[in-house]
């Protein structure tokens, strides 16, 4: 048993039939010594008396809010949560496996630049009685500070018969050095509580590996005289790290016909302009990637040819 937060305890249980469970001793937070009784949740059944209560925790029916009373007055509450371990593996019932980039990916994180700011998100089908708490650090043995905000519901989607809820959190490394080579990874830890079930999820990454630039901005076309060619120009996204001479991007320019089956013409360039042939009803799209490190491409910025 360990304390998640003041008065909230997590009991770690091996989850199999007829498991012995864990013995837990609760102490009433009061200077009183006599006449103390204990109840669980909304029940008025007295479980025991005295300043301490010893219980055997085996299942969810044994978890919940334990309250000590004296003479009809509530003295204090303790909440017991359960963390299940089945076949040596901690349960992952609360979050959905996103399966990208690999199986057992519950947390996904992205950064728009090298400032030390990043966003993580996760999915669940649970809509109520759900709490998330996020902590992060750079390294784990001698951790350096990363500050995370509150996890918020960022999207709701219908997937077949189920509703899916996306939560996200923004974090910022306290003393980020954008130009420095990373040697220790960022660690992100998410505590999830659904009703009386506790689970924790972790992710470890280097900022350089989760970089995904915003799409190029101000995408414009300039027709070239007496030609089917156009000059496409764009700018670095505002959110990209500066100076651009050091934090450079490379770009992919694509001409796509109306039909997805039509052949795509692609041009790769380090410049912020390119000359392409603009076919009727086609569109021109540009995306960006870190020039010196193959992290994710940005989403496409697009304009119609006409």
């Amino acid at each position: 048993i360990w304390e998640l937060k003041k008065d909230v305890y997590v009991v770690e249980l091996d989850w199999y039939p007829d498991a012995p469970g864990e013995m837990v001793v609760l102490t009433c937070d009061t200077p009183e010594e006599d006449g103390i009784t204990w109840t669980l949740d909304q029940s008025s059944e007295v479980l025991g008396s005295g300043k301490t209560l010893t219980i055997q925790v085996k299942e969810f029916g044994d978890a919940g809010q334990y309250t000590c009373h004296k003479g009809g007055e509530v003295l204090s509450h303790s909440l017991l949560l359960l963390h299940k371990k089945e076949d040596g593996i901690w349960s992952t019932d609360i979050l959905k496996d996103q399966k990208e980039p690999k199986n057992k990916t519950f947390l996904r994180c992205e950064a728009k630049n090298y400032s030390g700011r990043f966003t993580c998100w996760w999915l669940t089908t649970i809509s109520t009685d759900l709490t998330f708490s996020v902590k992060s650090s750079r390294g784990s043995s001698d951790p350096q500070g990363v500050t995370c905000g509150a996890a918020t519901l960022s999207a709701e989607r219908v997937r077949g018969d189920n509703k899916e809820y996306e939560y996200s959190v923004e974090c910022q490394e306290d003393s980020a050095c954008p130009a420095a080579e990373e040697s220790l990874p960022i660690e992100v830890m998410v505590d999830a509580v659904h009703k009386l079930k506790y689970e924790n999820y972790t992710s470890s990454f280097f900022i350089r590996d989760i970089i995904k630039p915003d799409p190029p901005k101000n995408l414009q076309l300039k027709p070239l005289k007496n030609s089917r060619q156009v000059e496409v120009s764009w700018e670095y996204p505002d959110t990209w790290s500066t100076p651009h001479s050091y934090f450079s991007l490379t770009f992919c320019v694509q001409v796509q016909g109306k039909s997805k089956r039509e052949k795509k013409d692609r041009v790769f360039t380090d410049k912020t302009s390119a000359t392409v042939i603009c076919r009727k009803n086609a569109s021109i799209s540009v995306r960006a990637q870190d020039r010196y490190y193959s992290s994710s491409w940005s989403e496409w910025a697009s304009v119609p040819c006409s």
Epitope: K5, V8, V74, H77, L79, V193
Partner: nanobody
Framework: EVQLVESGGGLVQAGGSRRVSCAAS????????MAWFRQAPGKEREFVAA????????DYADSVKGRFTISRDNAKNTVYLQMNSLKPEDTAAYYC????????????????WGQGTQVTVSS
Amino acid sequence: EVQLVESGGGLVQAGGSRRVSCAASGLTFSDYSMAWFRQAPGKEREFVAAHAWLASRTDYADSVKGRFTISRDNAKNTVYLQMNSLKPEDTAAYYCAAGQRYLSRVSQGYEYWGQGTQVTVSS
């Protein structure tokens, strides 16, 4: 600097309703349990209701159970106290408090306090 600012107090007739709010700043709101206490003239400050940092976990004093509802909006960093079927004995200054404990009924369980908002129930 942590600030808790209560609002919504005022004069209300017995049997009526009122909602008081408490806006928090300077703390990670979702990590804190929030509570309402009240103090009537010449009386000690007493616990009214608490909402833990954990979803759906609330606690009420017997005197307000079934009449008052505490709720919180983590996106707005705000906690509310909806008071229905008000009685003259509910007249008091209502104080908002924030603390790291789960659900405490004692004032020592809360580190931060607001300045209070006055609710007067006339008969």
